[in-house]
């Protein structure tokens, strides 16, 4: 999902030496940055989250807050510290004039400051309900395990916790952090205030229409009676959950965030911290018919972001808008006319639509999976959600053309059995943000901390790219794609897999002098080839065509253009075996695919040859897709011939371990 260099507005206020010495310059002369919501109507100027550097202690946070107040007072400004953060992120929430930002950015320990902004419930029309008869009953659904070992936290509106659908299933915490309702004539009608949260609690764990009927829930009120909240209120709610987890550790935790605001660095950072503490976060992609990467928490890579589809598996249209899409969406789930508890009466039901409802479905499925396998990590859970999803059922024509390739064609489903998937080698495809069009622009795709990067490919709509390479960054391999002169930009595509006890390395061969092309293989004992990448410095590789098929007996070999450097991803893991599968088409074709057969998982996807008419290669589920320029522009020369190269792997070790458990 979203990289650190995400699409949000960043204002860097330079530190000036004219400051009257009251503030220490930040360490190492680094410049603290200021961020605010890119969507102007959602901004809340006057309230700021001051985020301090990671190692900052609570006492230092309090001291920094006091220092800001003292310095502001000397300048004749009143400030109010609304909250001091600790446990999740170090920092504080302050009410102050925007005039003090430059001063605040110079304080010691300050990493960045973010102006507060609004977040919104993601259901339409959540407060204009269509009531269905109280006698309504969803078709009986009896799951094998109701998620009884899992606790689901819901950050939403207030809820009617004694509704028959959810009575005894939801504990309303005393947490409440909501803004005042807009408008002087707003009338707080309890049933409307509770509408969104009650419905979602019912979708997650309702006795009749719930997904995980055995899951217990805890609700935190972060949205007001109009379904509106703030980034700061959500942050404090997430901190509350972390503190509760530390005070009383329970079983697996799922946090449902059925809300969205503009891109927020601080909200994404808090989600990352909570996820790394072992909490599964599920969020709504947003109802703006837009790129989910422009919203938070949808854009946080550690969060499971859910788009909405209807009963026909089509993306949900909501008035003039609809579900968000793009690379920051992990999967889709039912989100149109979803029946659930209505706060209008204790036995009423209502249908609501939106990505909130879709996220609630996935939170329920996650609770079921975690109840069956409580030791699952976030990475394992995400991979299972993807693996068990219905594939390629969404009509992609609904999405903007440039987003189709980036948007996962996956609709969430419960696994056929809650046990027994352990033997599978799970992989997923992670797209980077777009590099931008400059000559030296690059794009980076990253895997989650406990996933292995098994291959790296790249894609450019213009075809002007300089390939890709795997490189170490902060002790982990990342996938970097390179734009070319005149190119409109590139994407890096990482294939991220769960491979316990893996030892992976990258072997590189520089461009070959000979006309035979460049080759590289896995020479270490017990290492197998999981992916091939190629990267070149020249602007156009020309038409040189290397021999596509590998010599017999050398499956652990990558081949490529003689002017390109070739990178082989070589891994050693217990019982790991891989094979190369190729599909070549002599005539020019816009798309060439090759799939791994049942029982094998696609780990690597690349194209031969790497000439400039190839737009790139990427994995879609278990299929390697190679895209070329429009046939009409390519002509039917031999240059048009393209081969899709898939590397398919399986783990006999995982299969054996699974059999031993059964």
């Amino acid at each position: 999902q979203e990289d650190e260099d995400g699409d949000y507005e960043e204002l860097v206020l330079a530190l000036r030496s004219e400051e009257d010495g009251l503030a220490e310059a930040p360490e190492h002369g680094t410049t603290a940055t200021f961020h605010r919501c890119a969507k102007d109507p959602w901004r809340l100027p006057g309230t700021y989250v001051v985020v301090l550097k990671e190692e900052t202690h609570l006492s230092q946070s309090e001291r920094t807050a006091r220092r800001l107040q003292a310095q502001a007072a000397r300048r004749g400004y009143l400030t109010k510290i609304l909250h001091v953060f600790h446990g999740l992120l170090p920092g504080f929430l302050v009410k102050m004039s925007g005039d003090l930002l430059e001063l605040a950015l110079k304080l010691p320990h300050v990493d960045y400051i973010e102006e507060d902004s609004s977040v919104f419930a993601q259901s339409i029309p959540w407060n204009l309900e269509r009531i269905t008869p109280p006698r309504y009953r969803a078709d009986e659904y009896q799951p094998p395990d109701g998620g009884s070992l899992v606790e689901v936290y819901l950050l939403d509106t207030s809820i009617q916790s004694d509704h028959r659908e959810i009575e005894g299933r939801v504990m309303v915490t005393d947490f409440e952090n909501v803004p005042e309702e807009d408008g002087t004539r707003f009338h707080r009608q309890a049933s409307k205030c509770d509408s969104h949260g009650t419905h979602l609690a019912g979708v997650v764990s309702g006795r009749d229409a719930g997904v995980a009927k055995g899951a217990s829930m805890r609700s935190l009120r972060v949205l007001n009676c109009q379904g509106k909240g703030t980034v700061s209120g959500t942050l404090i709610g997430l901190e509350f959950i972390r503190k509760s987890q530390l005070v009383q550790p329970v079983g697996p935790l799922v946090v449902l965030l059925p809300l969205a605001g503009g891109y927020s660095r601080v909200l994404n950072a808090a989600c990352q911290r909570l996820a790394r503490a072992g909490v599964v976060l599920v969020t709504a992609a947003g109802n703006f018919r837009d790129d989910a990467c422009l919203y938070s928490p949808a854009s946080a890579p550690e969060v499971i972001t859910v788009g909405a589809t209807n009963a026909q598996d089509q993306p949900v249209t909501l008035g003039t808008l609809g579900t968000n899409f793009g690379r920051c969406v992990d999967l889709f789930a039912p989100g149109e006319d979803i029946i659930g508890a209505s706060s209008d009466c204790s036995t009423c039901f209502v249908s609501q639509s939106g990505t909130s409802q879709a996220a609630a479905h996935v939170a329920g499925i996650a609770a079921m999976m975690l109840s069956a396998e409580p030791e699952l990590t976030l990475a394992e859970l995400r991979q299972r959600l993807i693996h068990f999803s219905a594939k390629d059922v969404i009509n992609e024509a609904w999405f903007p053309e440039d987003q189709r390739v980036l948007t996962p064609n996956l609709v969430a489903a419960l696994p056929p059995s809650t046990h027994g998937a352990g033997w599978q080698l799970f992989c997923r495809t992670v797209w980077s943000a777009h590099s931008g069009p400059t000559r030296m622009a690059t794009a980076v795709a990253r895997c989650a901390p406990d996933e292995e990067l098994l291959s790296c490919s790249s894609f450019s709509r213009s075809g002007k790219r300089r390939g890709e390479r795997m490189e170490a960054q902060g002790g982990k391999l990342v996938c970097r794609a390179h734009n070319a002169f005149g190119g409109e930009g590139v994407y890096a595509i990482a294939r991220c897999c769960l491979l316990p006890q893996a030892n992976c390395s990258v072997h590189t061969a520089p461009p070959a002098e000979a006309s035979m092309g460049t080759r590289v293989h896995c020479h270490q004992q017990g290492h197998v080839l999981t992916g091939c990448s190629s990267h070149w410095e020249v602007e156009d590789l020309g038409t040189h065509k290397p021999p596509v098929l590998r010599p017999r007996g050398q499956p652990n070999q990558c081949v490529g253009h003689r002017e390109a450097s070739i990178h082989a991803s070589c891994c050693h893991a217990p019982g790991l075996e891989c094979k190369v599968k190729e599909h070549g088409i002599p005539a020019p074709q816009e798309q060439v695919t090759v799939a791994c057969e049942e029982g094998w998982t696609l780990t690597g996807c690349s194209a031969l040859p790497g000439t400039s008419h190839v737009l790139g290669a990427y994995a879609v589920d278990n299929t390697c897709v190679v895209r070329s320029r429009d046939v009409s522009t390519t002509g039917s020369t031999s240059e048009g011939a393209v081969t899709a190269v898939a590397i398919c792997c399986r783990s006999r070790h995982l299969a054996q371990a699974s059999q031993e458990l059964q």
């Epitope: 009953r137 004694d162 009575e167 504990m171 204790s346 036995t347």
Partner: antibody, heavy 115, light 107 residues
Amino acid sequence: QVQLVQSGAEVKKPGASVKVSCKASGYTVTSYGISWVRQAPGQGLEWMGWLSFYNGNTNYAQKLQGRGTMTTDPSTSTAYMELRSLRSDDTAVYYCARGYSLDVWGQGTTVTVSS
Amino acid sequence: DIQMTQSPSSLSASVGDRVTITCRASQSVRNWLDWYQQKPGKAPKLLIYGASTLESGVPSRFSGSGSGTDFTLTISSLQPEDFATYYCQQDNDIPLTFGQGTKVEIK
């Protein structure tokens, strides 16, 4: 521990009213409503209705509508059931029970209607 | 309203006997059926909910089965403390309705 404690026995004349109380403790009262169930001497159980501690909403059985009123005092976690225009066939033991699931019951309050 | 009919209305059995009580609903209640035990002068006590799930603290000799319209409560080996009246109750629709009860007496 989770318990529902009801008020003591009542003897009423026909036409009078009775108000039975039920104090809940040992759990988060707003997570459940209170159901009222009555049992005439030697007879079976009859559900009278449900009441919310959270917002005071009620759900009455058809038979009770008009004559019965269920209320709460959230500050003391107490639920009340008032029955007006009492008749001799209202003589019964009145029970409060937790929620719609009826998983915890009060000890019962005997109401005798006799002239 | 959904009518609940229990049979038999009473039965005599000895300690150690296997006892079966049936309950029929006038329309499907899916698996939303609960069983209660009531002793003289006491409040009913929940034994089984959701047709077959034993309430915590209830001895395993009690079991429930069935779905739709036909349900059964079984006591595998009757104990002295089990002599009481048993009620079924549907929890599928409002109003909640009870069976007329089955009295289990000592033979």
